[in-house]
């Protein structure tokens, strides 16, 4: 039948192309300081000097030139406390998400050259500086060493480190994905004394195998130690090395508390209160219990205690503790009480004050919205963000709690700084927050602003992305609106991307894009020129991105109603907004499609599937396609265990697989990177499976030796431009 | 192979200042992953470590010692040295050097230790 | 600082016999334990290190357990040349301790 295709007519600006995407032509850029004292900071120039600022006196200069830079191919550096020595770091080779290996140089700043002699091994895992002085710990080959100063020869501080088995000072492959979001797990004390690390023991877990093919006549198999739901876990201990005799004496580990002890768990984070008191957390590996524990340094028994009476239990009673993952404590300058964000009886999470025990624990937020991020506490002020600012769950402010006065004093820092352009923020604190950093990320262009952190006065603009602002001047973008829709008792933020000189009277058609994951958000008031707003400003498609159930920061009410069910109403509220959608008038219900990566692959995968015929067509990129195949932290958390006395039977009704029948009258096309480490290409190929089993016609491409990202620059180009075909036949749009 | 031999006088008077010498042969006293230390064996009794010495200089003594030990090196002449001031009779003892190879790996190279007497 | 208690403080055996040595911490030393031999007017010599990792050229008979705080030195058939006294020793806590020492004479 004939094409419906939307051209926009009389402007002389140009729509957006797939080549503006795919090139990066509209990125836009930040500007974060990297604090180096209450006033001041460094910051990488475009040109690659490092460069020094000092806010009070206005002065400014380079440190560290770009030709010393250049001469070991740095890309990144460090600056030790003592401000003696800078590490670069060159020879980049990511591993998985977090994790990097790197070859690190030390330069001497007051000699003006590098330092010669015991220089670091390569490649190493992980380097950092200790809070004080010019310490080095690093880790190489699984195992943690220590410099007194960089010119020193090193003390192997563990010796158990094996490859694929026992990682110190690093995580494995799920704590790091999972639980920890690092490349790292080892933590000095605020003056140098202490270290403390996590021993990861993978001894006993299955392994996932996958070939990269490269350029060999053979290919190389990849070995990962990966517990996928139900499996053994790695087993944890944290230690802490006292860094006076690292020679002399082992590192001292830190006892778990018996109530988390009794059965299998996890280590979630570990903070530093004080030079000789320590914070742990741990979570039961059902996931609804967590329990902080404060530990203090023995100095007659040269041991770190744990009293029961520093326990406090954090347990949630509908879902999984905390968001996606457990809060971090923030303790105040006494060093015993804390501020930490946790669902209040209303199922809103919110920053409480513990002095003594979490039962007493004092309320310092309320309402129908719900804090974010704990920023800094400082001896008079709380920063944190939230999304209380007119009720919209997707925006992001900054506020400012006087916690010295009575009662505590609420300002909005951010709220009505550029109302229009900034809704969304995030922000970097000097030590003490004399100064602060804020960045903002939309939903106009991203801006990066320097604060005074006692009267919020904007001091300097760090970066406002004018050259974006001029090169967007000619190009005609869609339009973005951010609005909610009812249906029955529930309420759905959803995020539309309307095509130029959009006409009401017109139908388009539709681009779900879907996440969707627990604790996820995607409707935010960010900026953004990707791929679905080339959709929207060339070929005239409406995009819409909806938070259905189980998304976050909306209460738990909303976020726990996924729990041990996940597949079932991320799916139904996503074709409750297509129906509303349809409703609207101005889309073209023949033409409508869903697409999504990882969860959101799994979601659209199964929206396709859902027998309603709202679907024409849709992608489903890196789907998991059964949460027994996905990694235990994740999929346990959310659905519990795949055992017949838990939950196996929502875990075999919620896989792709057993909806093959569904797919035969949609048109799907199903992508997935052969050396994907995350979600295992195992995923797809099941799916495949599944649909030549049941006769299912599909379509199908992977992508050779990539993961989870397909981000290689040839790969990601044929990604977009392969769905874009996909998408433009479906919709029956001329190229 | 590494080798250490201790030296210095058998007898000394109370209240005066013991001074021993260890002597490595067949090894580097620089090498980057050894302390050297001193451990003492009073007679019939256990053995208790007196303290420690990187090449570098960087010393480490047990508490109950502290006040009267100092263990220096001399990595020119292969050599480190202790000296124990004050002494009484209960500083009668066989001293040893070892080579430490820290906590994990232990004191893997002993000297065959010297005899120090106090008695005035 | 930690105390090492081994028992038995005498133990009397004939070659080729078994012999059991114990090493208890009055807090835990994890894995951080050594086991030293020493012979009549001779230095200690290191057998053990890290509770059960034999040191070069120890023969396979001896042999190290434990963890925490309950330590075992294992010979498994006692040659003439093993009768002389042990010595654990903890590198957990500061400053490094020895055990008073277990004696292990002939029969």
């Known amino acids: 039948r004939p094409s419906r295709v939307y051209k926009p007519e009389g402007n002389t600006k140009r729509a957006l192309t797939l080549k503006d995407i795919l090139n990066g032509t509209f990125s836009y850029k930040t500007y974060f300081p990297n604090w180096i004292s209450e006033q001041e900071y460094l910051h990488q120039s475009e040109d690659d000097n490092i460069v020094f600022y000092n806010i009070e006196t206005r002065e400014s200069y380079i440190i560290l030139s770009n030709s010393t830079m250049k001469s070991v191919n740095a890309t990144d550096y460090g600056l030790s406390p003592d401000r003696q020595f800078v590490y670069l770091e060159s020879d980049y080779s990511k591993l998985w998400r977090y994790s990097y290996t790197a070859t690190y140089y030390i330069y001497d700043l007051q000699n003006g050259e590098f330092v010669r002699g015991y220089e670091l091994p390569r490649p190493i895992q992980y380097l950092c500086w200790s809070p004080v002085g010019s310490k080095l710990a690093y880790v190489y080959q699984n195992n943690i060493y220590l410099k007194q100063r960089p010119g020193d020869p090193p003390f192997q501080i563990t010796y158990t480190g094996r490859e694929n088995r026992i990682f110190n000072g690093i995580p494995d492959w799920v704590y790091e994905e999972e639980m920890l979001a690092t490349k790292y797990a080892l933590w000095w004390s605020p003056d140098g004394k202490f270290l403390a690390y996590v021993e990861f023991n993978d001894s006993d877990i299955p392994i996932i195998a996958y070939s990269y093919y490269g350029d060999g006549q053979y290919p190389r198999t990849i070995n990962i130690p990966y517990p996928k739901a139900g499996a053994k876990n790695p087993v944890v201990r944290v230690f802490i090395v006292d860094t006076t005799y690292p020679h002399h004496v082992g590192p001292m580990e830190v006892p778990v508390p018996e109530m988390i002890a009794s059965s299998d768990y996890y280590f979630s984070w570990l903070t530093w209160v004080s030079s000789e008191r320590v914070c742990l957390q741990w979570l039961k590996r059902v996931q609804n219990v967590s329990v902080l524990s404060i530990c203090d340094f023995r100095e007659d028994w040269h041991a770190w205690e744990c009293p029961k009476n520093q326990e406090h239990v954090e347990e949630s009673r509908t879902g999984w503790a905390g968001g996606f993952f457990v809060s971090t404590p923030a303790f105040s300058q006494d060093a015993t009480s804390y501020y930490k964000i946790f669902s209040d009886k209303d199922g809103y999470k919110h920053i409480h004050y513990i002095k003594d025990t979490v039962e007493n624990a004092i309320q310092i937020t309320s309402g129908k919205w719900e804090a974010i991020y704990i920023f800094r506490v400082t001896q008079d002020s709380l920063f944190y963000s939230s999304n209380e600012f007119e009720g919209y769950p997707g925006r992001r402010n900054i506020y400012r709690i006087s916690i010295g006065n009575s009662p505590p004093s609420k300002k909005c820092v951010t709220c009505h700084l550029r109302k229009e352009r900034c809704q969304y923020y995030t922000a970097s604190f000097s030590y003490k927050a004399k100064y602060y950093a804020l960045v903002c990320y939309g939903p106009g262009l991203p801006i990066s602003t320097l604060h005074d952190g006692r009267t919020d006065q904007e001091i300097q603009v760090l970066e406002e992305n004018k050259e974006l602002e001029n090169s967007l001047r000619n190009i005609q973008l869609p339009k973005v609106e951010i609005k909610k829709l009812k249906d029955g008792g529930l309420t759905f933020w959803y995020k539309m991307i309307l095509p130029p000189q959009f006409d009401r009277s017109k139908k388009y058609p539709l681009l779900i894009q879907v996440y969707g994951g627990p604790c996820s958000q995607s409707v935010k008031s960010v900026f953004a020129v990707n791929w679905i707003t080339y959709l929207a400003s060339k070929e005239g498609i409406v995009i819409a991105l909806v938070d259905g159930r189980g998304t976050a920061f909306q209460g738990d009410k909303f976020l726990h109603a996924v729990y041990r069910k996940l597949g079932v109403y991320e799916v139904e509220d996503q074709l409750t907004a297509v129906r509303k959608f349809i409703e609207m008038g101005f889309i073209d219900e023949e033409r409508i499609a869903i697409w999504g990566w990882s969860y959101g692959g799994y979601v659209s995968s199964l929206a396709l599937a859902s027998g309603t015929g709202l679907f024409k067509c849709g992608i489903a990129v890196a789907p998991v396609s059964s949460w027994e195949y996905y990694a235990s932290i994740y999929s346990e958390r959310f659905m519990g265990l795949p055992t017949k006395d838990d939950n196996l039977e929502h875990y075999k009704n919620s896989t792709v697989m057993a909806r093959a029948e569904y797919f035969r009258n949609v048109d799907y096309l199903l992508i997935h990177g052969t050396a994907d480490d995350n979600v295992h290409f195992q995923n797809s190929a099941q799916i495949a499976k599944a649909l030549v089993n049941a006769q299912v016609d599909f379509q199908a491409m992977w992508y050779s030796d990539q993961n989870h990202g397909i981000s290689s620059g040839r790969s990601q180009n044929h990604l977009y431009t392969h769905m874009t075909h996909f998408l433009k036949q479906c919709f029956s749009l001329s190229d | 192979q590494l080798q250490l031999q201790e030296s210095g006088p058998g007898l000394v008077k109370p209240s005066e200042t013991l001074s021993l010498t260890c002597t490595v042969s067949g090894g580097s006293i620089s090498s980057s992953s050894s302390y050297w230390g001193w451990i003492r064996q009073p007679p019939g009794k256990g053995l208790e470590w007196i303290g420690s010495i990187y090449y570098s200089g960087s010393t480490n003594y047990n508490p109950s010692l502290k006040s009267r030990v100092t263990i220096s090196v001399d990595t020119s002449k292969n050599q480190f040295s202790l000296k124990l001031r004050s002494v009484t009779a209960a500083d009668t003892a066989v001293y040893y050097c070892?080579?430490?190879?820290?906590?994990?790996?232990?004191?893997?190279?002993w000297g065959q230790g010297t005899t120090v007497t106090v008695s005035s | 600082e930690i105390v090492l208690t081994q028992s038995p403080a005498t133990l009397s055996l004939s070659p080729g016999e078994r012999a059991t040595l114990s090493c208890r911490a009055s807090?835990?030393?994890?894995?951080?334990l050594a086991w030293y031999q020493q012979k009549p007017g001779q230095a200690p010599r290191l057998l053990i290190y890290d509770a059960s990792n034999r040191a070069t050229g120890i023969p396979a008979r001896f042999s190290g357990s434990g963890s925490g705080t309950d330590f075992t030195l294992t010979i498994s058939s006692l040659e003439p040349e093993d009768f002389a006294v042990y010595y654990c020793q903890q590198r957990s806590n500061w400053p490094p301790t020895f055990g008073q020492g277990t004696k292990v004479e002939i029969k």
């Open positions: 807090q835990s030393v994890s894995s951080y």
């Open positions: 070892v080579r430490d190879k820290g906590y994990y790996y232990g004191m893997d190279v």
